[in-house]
């Protein structure tokens, strides 16, 4: 004969555990029903009656099958530097993540506790490592032959234009100025250079790195429009 299915509440066999979505109530010494996500235990079970569940109130939630007497409070509203990526419902907590241009400086179990603005690299510096959801931008000086004249959390160092005749040589924060109306060519059309490592120039030197520590500094990417004027914001 098949084993009889026990309905909650029931006394478990000695040494056995309660079934999935049930819990053992120490007071009643019975296996009782858990409440579903979005509910909580309004009345605990007895030897003769099962758990009475009730829906979570506004701004509270339970995410798991449970027997908690009260639902958990949803986190406070997202701050101005955050966006709500998951709303507070009866079954899930609100999740706040950092808005574009910011990163999470202090995370919590889900979402972010403290957002901070992404660092903006000043002229002469380019983005060496872009910001992520959880890490800030890393700025490094532009290598010889490259420049950045913007203040930006996204702009990398770009190659100086190459002139037939140079009127003003380029430096880390300024492009070369040509005497002719147009430069002969740009350094490898479409080439965009990350700031480091730096090779030798009059004031800018570096010991030759080991091959394993010298990342490629040239990435072929489509070139964007010419940058804003010196000191303007590039993002």
């Amino acid at each position: 004969l098949p084993a009889q299915v026990a309905f909650t509440p029931y006394a478990p066999e000695p040494g056995s555990t309660c079934r999935l979505r049930e819990y053992y109530d120490q007071t009643a010494q019975m296996c009782c029903s858990k409440c579903s996500p979005g509910q909580h235990a309004k009345v605990f079970c007895t030897k003769t009656s099962d758990t009475v569940c009730d829906s979570c109130e506004d701004s509270t939630y339970t995410q798991l099958w449970n027997w908690v007497p009260e639902c958990l409070s949803c986190g406070s509203r997202c701050s101005s530097d955050q966006v709500e990526t998951q709303a507070c419902t009866r079954e899930q907590n609100r999740i706040c993540t950092c808005r574009p241009g910011w990163y999470c400086a202090l995370s919590k179990q889900e979402g972010c506790r403290l957002c901070a603005p992404l660092r903006k690299c000043r002229p002469g510096f380019g983005v060496a490592r872009p910001g992520t959801e959880t890490s800030d931008v890393v700025c490094k000086p532009c290598a010889p032959g490259t420049f950045s004249n913007t203040t930006s959390s996204t702009d990398i160092c770009r190659p100086h234009q190459i002139c037939n005749v140079v009127a003003i040589p380029g430096n880390a924060s300024m492009d070369a100025v040509c005497t002719s109306t147009s430069p002969t060519r740009s350094m490898a059309p479409g080439a965009v250079h990350l700031p480091q490592p730096v090779s030798t120039r009059s004031q800018h030197t570096q010991p030759t790195p080991e091959p394993s520590t010298a990342p490629s500094t040239s990435f072929l990417l489509p070139m964007g429009p010419s940058p804003p004027a010196e000191g303007s914001t590039g993002d």
Epitope: N171, Q196, Q206, G231
Partner: antibody, heavy 119, light 107 residues
Framework: EVQLQQSGPEVGRPGSSVKISCKAS????????MHWVKQSPGQGLEWIGW????????DYAEKFKKKATLTADTSSNTAYIQLSSLTSEDTATYFC????????????WGQGVMVTVSS | NIVMTQSPKSMSMSVGERVTLTCKAS??????VSWYQQKPEQSPKLLIY???NRYTGVPDRFTGSGSATDFTLTISSVQAEDLADYHC?????????FGGGTKLEIK
């Protein structure tokens, strides 16, 4: 907490060299370049140059190209300045200062090292 | 090289007075000017960056302003602990340069 701890005072003979250190803690050493700044007694501040600990690349003010050598050791999170061919003009306090590449080149400073050149 | 000229060289003020220090750049440095406070026998500390941004923990009596070539540091109500040398510096182009400093004495 970001800290830049510099080595103790140095006395050097004219013509000799000294090497002073700046040990960084409280941040990722390779994410920031390190500047060195000179302050002669009763004088203003003079920028010497910077070293990028990640790549060992450097840049110097013209005046200090033959005088100073900047290096960094990532295993100990320490930046160094070596001053060569010392003269009385090199008697000064030397500061290291961190730079994140954003608005200000010098957001944290070491406490400074007094170098005295005397025969 | 960009020359940064600070004035006055020194000044003596009473507690509670308003102090204005100026810094002039020989070329346009946009807003890449910082102000540093150096108390006797100490290293410089960053007060203002980007011409007008107060650094973390700096009292709000310190205010920076200006752009291009003319910059000002104002202490709205000077305190005894503000006795120090004040340096301006440009971080716009190499070589980075500083003003000669202003020595602030308290009467």
């Amino acid at each position: 907490e970001v800290q830049l701890q510099q080595s103790g005072p140095e006395v050097g003979r004219p013509g000799s060299s000294v090497k002073i250190s700046c040990k960084a803690s409280g941040y990722t050493f390779t994410d920031y370049i390190m500047h060195w700044v000179k302050q002669s007694p009763g004088q203003g501040l003079e920028w010497i140059g910077w070293v990028d600990p990640e790549y060992g690349s450097t840049d110097y003010a013209e005046k200090f190209k033959k005088k100073a050598t900047l290096t960094a050791d990532t295993s100990s999170n320490t930046a160094y300045i070596q001053l060569s061919s010392l003269t009385s003009e090199d008697t000064a306090t030397y500061f290291c200062a961190r730079d994140d590449g954003s608005y200000s080149p010098f957001d944290y400073w070491g406490q400074g090292v007094m170098v005295t050149v005397s025969s | 090289n960009i020359v940064m000229t600070q004035s006055p060289k020194s000044m003596s003020m009473s507690v509670g007075e308003r102090v204005t220090l100026t810094c002039k750049a020989s070329e346009n440095v946009v807003t890449y000017v910082s102000w540093y406070q150096q108390k006797p026998e100490q290293s410089p500390k960053l007060l203002i960056y980007g011409a007008s941004n107060r650094y973390t923990g700096v009292p709000d009596r310190f205010t920076g302003s200006g752009s291009a070539t003319d910059f000002t540091l104002t202490i709205s109500s000077v305190q005894a602990e503000d006795l120090a040398d004040y340096h301006c510096g440009q971080g716009y182009s190499y070589p980075y340069t500083f003003g000669g400093g202003t020595k602030l004495e308290i009467k």
